[in-house]
């Protein structure tokens, strides 16, 4: 419901790739996090809890991802100029109720020094 620019470092570059950091409040137990490029869903990750507090992680649009207790990182590799765009983290909260959606994002600038395979 609260939409805006990420007020943290959302993009972390390394080895010709980028880690896109999508945060969520640590009170949140069950959620879906989608990574959007423009309006297109690139990746998603859903965390649910079953009986006995068993945690289930599912992805419909799979990307290499990493989950912590307050963030989901999505990794994009082999960067080129076509990756430059607005990226958004779309968080849907299921638990605690009630259902909430919040969107935050930023622009990914691609500089020559960050490209995967530069011509020498």
């Amino acid at each position: 419901e609260i939409n805006g620019s990420a007020n943290y470092e959302m993009f972390i570059f390394h080895n010709g790739g980028v880690q896109i950091l999508c945060k969520y409040p640590d009170i949140v137990q069950q959620f879906k996090m989608q990574l959007l490029k423009g309006g297109q869903i690139l990746c998603d990750l859903t965390k649910t809890k079953g009986s006995g507090n068993t945690v289930s992680i599912k992805s419909l649009k799979f990307c290499h991802s990493q989950l912590s207790n307050n963030s989901v990182s999505f990794f994009l590799y082999n960067l080129d100029h076509s990756h430059a765009n607005y990226y958004f983290c779309n968080l849907s909260i299921f638990d605690p109720p009630p259902f909430k959606v919040t969107l935050t994002g930023g622009y990914l600038h691609i500089y020559e020094s960050q490209l995967c395979c530069q011509l020498k």
Epitope: P25, I27, F99, K100
Partner: antibody
């Protein structure tokens, strides 16, 4: 002035139905989650139902399947449809605003910050 | 399911005295998600404290909240005649989404 005004209470026989309404004013109704909370005479507060800004609904076991909460944002109105009423449902019913704000980094809960004056429901033969 | 138990059920004090009301949860809850309400006879409840310790708008500073985990306290440092009422604690969570303690009645001795 921020205000919630309930209506629709009255006397109904066991097994009967009643629809409560709550008119909201003085704030952007569609931006807030809303609750119904009831209180039997001389007793404590009991949460009855909640509806999120997306229209998602929540109930405790005591009313699930019998009560239905709904909202009409265009009319700044909250409703509670009560079916299969029992004597134990007799109470004052309050319409309540829930104040919370969620960002990607924080989940702020500011409590139930606005209450209506209540409407009385009596279930008796 | 989280159950909130308030004590004492009734507290008899005189104006000017200090009141200490307790709210105990059956399992850990985050202090950010605990609130206190005051209800005077014939009136709707009103929000006093949210986030366990933050006063709601317009609430005098003689009211304070504290606690974490399973034990929470509402303190009224110096009772005024208008403070004699029933006080409820409330939590929000997953199951149930919302629950109240049974209340503490603060009466004039």
């Amino acid at each position: 002035e921020v205000q919630l005004v309930e209506s629709g209470g009255g006397l109904v026989q066991p097994g009967g139905s009643l629809r409560l309404s709550c008119a909201a004013s003085g704030f952007t109704f569609s931006s807030y989650d809303m609750h119904w909370v009831r209180q039997a005479t001389g007793k404590g507060l009991e949460w009855v139902s909640a509806i999120g800004t997306a229209g998602d609904t929540y109930y405790p076991g005591s009313v699930k399947g019998r009560f239905t909460i709904s909202r009409e944002n265009a009319k700044n109105s909250l409703y509670l449809q009560m079916n299969s009423l029992r004597a134990g449902d007799t109470a004052v019913y309050y319409c309540v605003r829930d104040n919370r704000k969620v960002t990607h980094e924080h989940y702020y809960y500011y409590g139930m910050d606005v209450w209506g004056q209540g409407t009385t429901v009596t279930v008796s033969s | 399911e989280i159950v909130l138990t308030q004590s004492p059920g009734t507290l008899s004090l005189s104006p000017g005295e200090r009141a200490t009301l307790s709210c105990r949860a059956s399992q850990n809850i985050r202090s950010s998600y605990l609130a206190w309400y005051q209800q005077k006879p014939g009136q709707a409840p009103g929000l006093l404290i949210y986030g366990a310790s933050s006063r709601a708008t317009g609430i005098p500073d003689r009211f304070s909240g504290s606690g974490s985990g399973t034990d929470f306290t509402l303190t009224i440092s110096r009772l005024e005649p208008e403070d004699f009422a029933v006080y409820y604690c409330q939590q929000f969570g997953s199951s149930p989404m919302c629950s109240f303690g049974q209340g503490t009645k603060l009466e004039i001795k």
